[in-house]
């Protein structure tokens, strides 16, 4: 229902305070009363949150898919819906709450995890993975001098990744979605492990290029685990650290 | 083609209060985010408000609480209540969107609000 | 806020002369790998027309003579040679942060 879509987008985690624009200082964003959230920004005004608005499940939270609210409703408005448990119809595997995955149209345990999780995560923050829906609905009614096949450059407004050119997301900034750069090994990104994670920020990054995957930065002097940067790592880093 | 037009625009007391619409058409007006910007007589430009495809509302300071953004998508409208209106608040008000770049590319002719006793 | 200032207040040229505006921010208004910066066109009793985003990318249907350029802090809109309907007020506008904000506007007349 229309209200349990609410409640699993009700209040979501804003991006990290570092690494650029994500975190402004001296902002904050109001979302319900006496609850603060620094990073965002004091010019946002949140009445009553509205579901976020999605073209592909990489951009809902690790719990959540993209669909329209609606059996059978306008494929143009879909918003993040919250996971399928077990048993539960499906129609693709990222419809499955995590630790499952869709199989003859049913949400079924994963025993090896081999769907969700860090594996899918890795696959979604690839570069080129663009799962973009096909939705129905095209961009403008009327393209004014835009020409339909036209590829959005840094900057423009886009609906979904597929919107932008090569090498470039599409992505959530203040009041549009746009354009932004693919990020480079090195950078900072944004690793959404929460439900729902990217429904409050204003200032979402891209995934991480092809190649790349956003893991903690490993960073032996550093004592607190909850400090560590994500960013985005060439693949064949990946190691099993022993914990003695 | 994308058009925006403005109406609702005239002369309101001090402390009186005013309702601007903006009636859109040639695009998927849910899908993209709508703003108001105003020009007082003479002068630049300055930002009034904005509210996305989602539905956030943005606010400056100078305005915060005395002014609503609202939209209506089943009818392609866009809604500026102003409350407590001031004197400072006489201008030209453009409604604009950001349909093809994270600008405001596509502006109405503007309505004009005078707040004079 | 973030403050534009474009200088210089008005630009005094002839038709086919080249137009160097510039807008100066007082933070970067970089950030993602984009400069979010916008350039507008005003002559009087219209709206605002939209040039330049992002720095550097011409707007729908926007003649070639119209470009710009910079990062960080200092952007430049070029007006490579003015035709008699360039003759307008130019803003520059920020779209880091909220508030969006303009520059005070340079004026380019006829001389």
């Known amino acids: 229902t229309l209200n349990s879509v609410l409640n699993s987008n009700a209040i979501k985690n804003l991006p990290p305070p570092l690494g650029g624009a994500a975190g402004h200082p001296g902002s904050a964003v109001s979302a319900a009363p006496g609850i603060l959230y620094p990073g965002g920004n004091k010019y946002q005004t949140i009445d009553n949150y509205q579901p976020y608005p999605c073209a592909e499940d990489e951009e809902c939270g690790t719990d959540e898919y993209c669909a329209s609210p609606t059996r059978g409703g306008d494929a143009g408005v879909q918003i993040c819906l919250a996971c399928r448990k077990r048993r539960k119809r499906c129609m693709r595997h990222a419809m499955c709450c995590p630790g499952n995955y869709c199989k003859n149209g049913i949400c079924v345990s994963s025993d090896q995890n081999h769907f969700r999780g860090e594996i899918e995560e890795t696959i979604t923050e690839s570069f080129g993975n663009d799962h973009s829906t096909l939705d129905g609905y095209s961009r403008r009614t009327t393209l004014s001098s835009k020409m339909y096949h036209t590829k959005g450059q840094e900057g423009s407004v886009c609906l979904r990744s597929s919107d932008c050119a090569s090498g470039l997301c599409c992505a959530r900034h203040f009041w549009s979605k746009i354009c932004k750069p693919v990020l480079k090994e090195g950078q900072v990104c944004t690793k959404h492990r929460r439900k729902g994670s990217h429904g409050l920020e204003i200032f979402q990054r891209c995934y991480c290029g092809e190649g790349l995957s956003c893991r903690i930065q490993k960073d032996h002097h550093q004592a607190s685990n909850s400090s560590r940067l994500h960013t985005c790592q060439r693949h064949h880093h990946h190691h099993h650290h022993h914990h003695h | 083609e994308v058009q925006l037009v403005e109406s609702g625009g005239g002369l309101v007391q001090p402390g009186g209060s005013l309702r601007l619409s903006c009636a859109a058409s040639?695009?998927?007006?849910?899908?993209?985010?709508i703003s108001w910007v105003r020009q007082a007589p003479g002068k630049g430009l300055e930002w009034v408000a904005s509210?996305?495809?989602?539905?956030?509302?943005y606010y400056p300071d100078s305005v915060k609480g005395r002014f609503t953004i609202s939209r209506d998508n089943a009818k392609n409208s866009l809604y500026l209540q102003m409350n407590s209106l001031r004197a400072e608040d006489t201008a030209v008000y453009y409604c604009a969107s950001s349909l093809d770049n994270y600008a405001f590319d596509y502006w109405g002719q503007g309505t004009t609000v005078t707040v004079s006793s | 806020e973030i403050v534009l200032t474009q200088s210089p207040a008005t630009l005094s040229l002839s038709p086919g002369e080249r137009a160097t505006l510039s807008c100066r921010a007082s933070e970067s208004v970089d950030d993602f790998g984009i400069s979010f910066i916008n350039w507008y066109q005003q002559k009087p009793g219209q709206a605002p027309r939209l040039l330049i985003y992002a720095g550097s990318k011409q707007g729908s249907g926007i003649p070639a003579r119209f470009s710009g350029s910079g990062s960080g802090t200092d952007f430049t809109l070029t007006i490579s040679s003015l035709e008699p309907e360039d003759f307008a007020v130019y803003y520059c506008?920020?779209?880091?942060?909220?508030?969006?904000?303009f520059g005070g506007g340079t004026k380019v007349e006829i001389k």
């Open positions: 506008q920020q779209l880091k942060e909220v508030p969006p904000t």
């Open positions: 509210v996305s495809g989602w539905g956030d509302t």
């Open positions: 040639g695009f998927t007006f849910s899908s993209y985010a």
